[in-house]
């Protein structure tokens, strides 16, 4: 079982300020695919058989100047803005979603436009029926323009 | 088929300002190797059999202060400098090179010397004869001093 | 053979200023595991059989303002602080530890609190008995609070 999913334009979904938002993905077009019973449905990659999987994702973020880049604040800096990616596992056997991987970075840019990727990848023991999703701190900062910049995948080792 | 290639000192090649430059690689010395008919030739990794490959690269960049770090510009920030890595596929069946993976980051540093890596990795369906290369936005910013800082590899899953 | 190790609180160990410090890891609890004779002992992952392994690690660093972020220094910037991760191989057959992977980044933040990950991953030919460890430039900057932020793993390809 294996899959490589690529970003698509996101439909804005209202969510609480500090709550992470789940991304939805392209699974059939361009370089995206699912194979050998790996299934993508409703923002989740669904694991078809138990085993050890390598899971990876890159999210490219872009935005305009973060507040802490304001020169007037340099003498009394504030907690910086940040960008966060979490790969989350939801299991039928366990009610609470589990954070498998987290990439988080403070963003304090003095330039007018900034952009940067967060990359994650590691191996996990997964059970048949486990569901994986990618959550981000701010969906509006995700670069959805190119399939090679923002993606999510997994394969059985 | 598998390969791990490491950086070597690059021969400066003139290229257009906004055109990405292809890196050439060490394929035999130190930790570099190619195996099971994976072949390296003229900046390209050549895929010997069709299948799903995990492809990865890290490029470490280093430079001196970018313009936007100039204190006089803080009040009127300009478009920042950036660093970009692209892993590109060239296929006989398709004339246009395809960008498989892109890592791009704005660079706006106020320190005199900066350095940072961009890491990429993902799984792709490749055909026999496909050729892979790594392109960068500015070859002169690539840290070629150590094989553990800048590298490129692939293996059949 | 495969392993995914996760961070735990580190015991401070005195070490020389420019010497890298080895991290110790969780190998049994939470999402951490070792499998198929891969063994973790005394900060080292011990390779049980020769072959090509994919090795990866993410270290999340966090700290307070680095010196070069001080506004008074902007006109005469100093060499910035930096964060470094090295995955090191120790082999019985070779007395000198070998740096397999290095991720290094200058840190020059004007915000009061900064945090960011360094991710590494690549394939290496290893011999039975080779030992792998992860070293960092400053153990006190490593975020040990969550197993999904700082981890180390390897699997036979």
């Amino acid at each position: 079982p294996k899959a490589h999913l690529t970003i698509m334009r996101q439909t804005p979904v209202p969510h609480l300020k500090n709550e992470l938002a789940a991304l939805h993905w392209e699974n059939n077009l361009g370089m995206a695919f699912t194979k050998n019973r790996m299934n993508y449905t409703n923002k989740f990659l669904v694991i078809p058989e138990s085993g050890d999987y390598f899971i990876y994702s890159q999210i490219t973020f872009r935005g305009t100047t973060s507040e802490c880049g304001d020169i007037s604040r340099v003498r009394r800096p504030k907690k910086p803005d940040s960008i966060t990616v979490v790969i989350t596992k939801v299991a039928d056997s366990y009610p609470e979603p589990a954070h498998l991987l987290t990439g988080t970075k403070s963003v304090c840019e003095i330039s007018s436009n900034w952009f940067q990727p967060i990359y994650l990848g590691a191996m996990f023991s997964l059970e048949e029926g486990d569901r994986l999703m990618v959550n981000v701190s701010d969906i509006s900062l995700v670069d959805y323009t190119k399939e090679d910049k923002t993606f999510f995948g997994a394969f059985l080792i | 088929p598998k390969a791990h290639l490491t950086i070597m000192r690059q021969t400066p090649v003139p290229h257009l300002k906004n055109e990405l430059a292809a890196l050439h690689w060490e394929n035999n010395l130190g930790m570099a190797f190619t195996k099971n008919r994976m072949n390296y030739t003229n900046k390209f990794l050549v895929i010997p059999e069709s299948g799903d490959y995990f492809i990865y690269s890290q490029i470490t960049f280093r430079g001196t202060t970018s313009e936007c770090g100039d204190i006089s510009r803080v009040r009127r920030p300009k478009k920042p400098d950036s660093i970009t890595v692209v892993i590109t596929k060239v296929a006989d069946s398709y004339p246009e090179p395809a960008h498989l993976l892109t890592g791009t980051k704005s660079v706006c540093e106020i320190s005199s010397n900066w350095f940072q890596p961009i890491y990429l990795g993902a799984m792709f369906s490749l055909e026999e004869g496909d050729r892979l290369m790594v392109n960068v936005s500015d070859i002169s910013l690539v840290d070629y001093t150590k094989e553990d800082k800048t590298f490129f590899g692939a293996f059949l899953i | 053979p495969k392993a995914h190790l996760t961070i735990m609180r580190q015991t401070p160990v005195p070490h020389l200023k420019n010497e890298l410090a080895a991290l110790h890891w969780e190998n049994n609890l939470g999402m951490a595991f070792t499998k198929n004779r891969m063994n973790y002992t005394n900060k080292f992952l011990v390779i049980p059989e020769s072959g090509d392994y994919f090795i990866y690690s993410q270290i999340t660093f966090r700290g307070t303002t680095s010196e070069c972020g001080d506004i008074s220094r902007v006109r005469r910037p100093k060499k910035p602080d930096s964060i470094t991760v090295v995955i090191t191989k120790v082999a019985d057959s070779y007395p000198e530890p070998a740096h397999l992977l290095t991720g290094t980044k200058s840190v020059c933040e004007i915000s009061s609190n900064w945090f960011q990950p360094i991710y590494l991953g690549a394939m290496f030919s290893l011999e039975e008995g080779d030992r792998l460890m992860v070293n960092v430039s400053d153990i006190s900057l490593v975020d040990y609070t969550k197993e999904d932020k700082t981890f180390f793993g390897a699997f036979l390809i």
């Epitope: 334009r9 996101q10 059939n28 077009l29 361009g30 695919f33 194979k35 | 369906s125 055909e127 | -």
Partner: antibody
């Protein structure tokens, strides 16, 4: 240049099945997703489903699920659409059409295959 | 499924006149395309991703819109533009088409 060449017109009886082929050339067959769209006489266009030639992954319009089967033979760069349990209202021109990414739209269309269902 | 309603169904226009066709979606759409189809021909991609001209399409064609309301404009109609025009959404499966707008030359 890109070409999608479809099989010829078919006349079928109600309850029978039809299999339409679409041979692709001029591009990497496994790199583009193949769609099937139909158009009844004087009617508008109706999307049947798609197949990713590389993975074999499919996505069907629920209206056709269970009756339409999309397959590919990558060795000859050919896609197939089989429609079973035909009814008279399945009489239509059936098009194959390839797309790379959803923001690209369907740039390449076959010439169409007329399937007539009549007793 | 997302229902696309085109308006008008039919338009008879003199050459050089401006033509405006609207496509209204029953829920928000991220990816909208427009196709032109002439009698006994396959559809042809005209406008992709709301406003981008497809390869080889004359600049008199343009597209705009967002959310649920989209527009195809032909700035100065030519005789060869007599055809039926369809909108199609690629936001959620099934990827539906509008009912079509037939443009006839007076």
């Amino acid at each position: 240049q890109v070409q999608l060449v479809q099989s010829g017109a078919e006349v079928k009886k109600p309850g029978a099945s039809v299999k339409v082929s679409c041979k692709a050339s001029g591009y990497s067959f496994t790199g583009y997703t193949m769609n099937w769209v139909r158009q009844a006489p004087g009617q508008n266009l109706e999307w049947i489903g798609l197949i990713n030639p590389y993975s074999g992954g499919t996505n069907y319009n629920q209206k056709f699920k269970g009756r339409a089967t999309l397959t590919v033979d990558t060795s000859i760069s050919t896609a197939y659409m089989e429609l079973s349990r035909l009814r008279s209202d399945d009489t239509a021109v059936y098009y194959c059409a390839s797309i790379y990414q959803r923001h690209d739209g369907i740039a390449y269309w076959g010439q169409g295959t007329l399937v007539t269902v009549s007793s | 499924e997302i229902v696309l309603t085109q308006s008008p169904d039919f338009q008879s226009v003199t050459p050089k006149e401006k033509v405006t066709i609207t496509c209204s979606a029953s829920s928000s759409v991220n990816y909208m395309h427009w196709y032109q189809q002439k009698p006994d021909q396959s559809p042809k991609l005209l406008i992709k991703d709301t406003s981008k001209l497809a390869s080889g399409v004359p600049s008199r064609f343009s597209g705009s819109g967002s959310g649920t309301d989209f527009t195809l404009t032909i700035n100065s109609l030519e005789a060869e533009d007599a055809a039926t025009y369809y909108c199609q959404q690629w936001s959620s499966s099934p990827y539906t088409f509008g009912g079509g707008t037939k443009v006839e030359i007076k």
